[in-house]
Amino acid sequence: CEAPPTFEAMELIGKPKPYYRVGERVDYKCKKGYFYIPPLATHTICDRNHTWLPVSDEGCYREMCPHIRDPLNGEAILANGSYEFGAELHFICNEGYYLIGKDILYCELKDTVAIWSGKPPLCEKILCTPPPKIKNGKHTFSEVEVFEYLDAVTYSCDPAPGPDPFSLIGESMIYCGNNSTWSHAAPECKVVKCRFPVVENGKQISGFGKKFYYKATVMFECDKGYYLNGSDKIVCESNSTWDPPVPKCLKVSTSPTTKSPTSSASGPRPTYKPPVSNYPGYPKPDEGILNNLDD
């Protein structure tokens, strides 16, 4: 017979020869990192038809790392389903907990023994320090010193000393999130008041108010014979300015060769612009949309 077969999990005892006589026996042993479990044979004989009798390495099993329990408030997941060396053990924590230690352990061979590459990690409860205090405002649970995962606080602004109230800029509610950090930056309390929006040759059609505070929204239309240059809708932003800026109502050019000043809309524009009140969706001037409006 020629050289005996080779296996992944077992190796020949002694040196292999180029040729073997009929009836000659060769013995195998489990390779390093594997151990033998009977009853499968670990030898073979050169048969009279010059082939080796059937043999396999199925009696050699990989060395296994010790079983690791799920961490408290977490889970250990075997990446390839067994504890044999070469295995990966992935650790995850339950919601509201974070991992202290390595999130992956590897089953490694040390000499002939399979051991894990490190200590299993722990799952600790996510805790946040108190959220920031803010000027001219406060948050709920201000007496609490430690916050747990998903604990939320709500900010509110103090009454203003003057005639205009403080506006809350940002998120009013924030919660203790992953990485023990708050979900958003603390908001700001300040007076935000935009100027009265004056549009010559036009008028406000919605968003009427005594004063215009944070996020107040106003819409305009132009008089007949004028068109809107800019946006018909503006919002009072945190820096006390209108965004987009207060529009202008510009006179319609009746000459077909003269271009009206550019409007804020993109794309090609006609050289003659009809008055805004002729656009679809705009009330006609004689419809008296402001009559009998309750603010």
């Epitope: 008041k193 935009c194 009265f196 406000q204 009427f208 402001l290 009559n291 009998n292 409006l293 603010d295």
Partner: antibody, heavy 118, light 107 residues
Framework: EVQLVESGGGLVQPGGSLRLSCAAS????????ISWIRQSPSRGLEWLGV???????NYNSAFMSRFTISRDDSKNTAYLQMNSLKTEDTAVYYC????????????WGQGTLVTVSS | AIQLTQSPSSLSASVGDRVTITCRAS??????LNWYLQKPGQSPQLLIY???SLHSGVPDRFSGSGSGTDFTLKISRVEAEDVGVYYC?????????FGQGTKVEIK
């Protein structure tokens, strides 16, 4: 609290010109929106125009061609330049601080009398 | 321009009376209406802004109401110091305009 004082009124012939001044004390004229308003027995109260803090202006179109509002920050004074004056322009002229950017008038001065007569 | 028409043009009341002055706009002005009082020999003074908000220092016997085109100024118990000419003013649209005035006298 800013105080506005009007001056420059007087007798002027029809067709003549006059420049009224509005001097600010206790504050900067450039920090406020300044309106000019006039009052006469025949025409009542009439708003003439405004100069905003950013230097922009709006006018009552009835006076736009003859009246101009300006401001000199170095002199801390706002002005109303009136040209081609008519007898019906005879009135008390007030400069008025627009209330905190809102068109209500809470700060009236004593006004200055302009008489247009030959 | 938006016209404001006040009525009555003048009225005479006794101290303690309730006085009502109306202001009608030629088109809807939402609540963008102010009221002023010009006492004899003085400059006008702001009483009420945005239809019903009392300016600082104004006694609470003054009140304003209305919306759209019809507005009212009420003095619940008129006093001698309330004599003068009352003006309304709109500011929804340029030019900002005033009513012709209502003269209030004390009997």
């Amino acid at each position: 609290e800013v105080q506005l004082v009007e001056s420059g009124g007087g007798l002027v012939q029809p067709g003549g010109s006059l420049r009224l001044s509005c001097a600010a004390s206790g504050g900067s004229v450039s920090s406020y929106d300044i309106s000019w308003i006039r009052q006469s027995p025949s025409r009542g109260l009439e708003w003439l125009g405004v100069i905003w803090t950013d230097g922009g202006t709006n006018y009552n179109s009835a006076f736009m061609s003859r009246f101009t509002i300006s401001r000199d920050d170095s002199k801390n004074t706002a002005y109303l330049q009136m040209n081609s004056l008519k007898t019906e322009d005879t009135a008390v002229y007030y400069c008025e601080r627009v209330y905190d950017g809102y068109p209500w008038f809470a700060y009236w001065g004593q006004g200055t009398l302009v008489t247009v007569s030959s | 321009a938006i016209q404001l028409t006040q009525s009555p043009s003048s009225l005479s009341a006794s101290v303690g009376d309730r006085v009502t002055i109306t202001c009608r706009a030629s088109q809807g002005i939402s609540n963008y209406l102010n009221w002023y009082l010009q006492k004899p020999g003085q400059s006008p003074q702001l009483l009420i802004y945005y239809t019903s908000s009392l300016h600082s220092g104004v006694p609470d016997r003054f009140s304003g109401s209305g919306s759209g085109t019809d507005f009212t100024l009420k003095i619940s118990r008129v006093e001698a110091e309330d004599v003068g000419v009352y003006y309304c003013q709109q500011y929804i649209k340029l030019p900002w305009t005033f009513g012709q005035g209502t003269k209030v006298e004390i009997k």
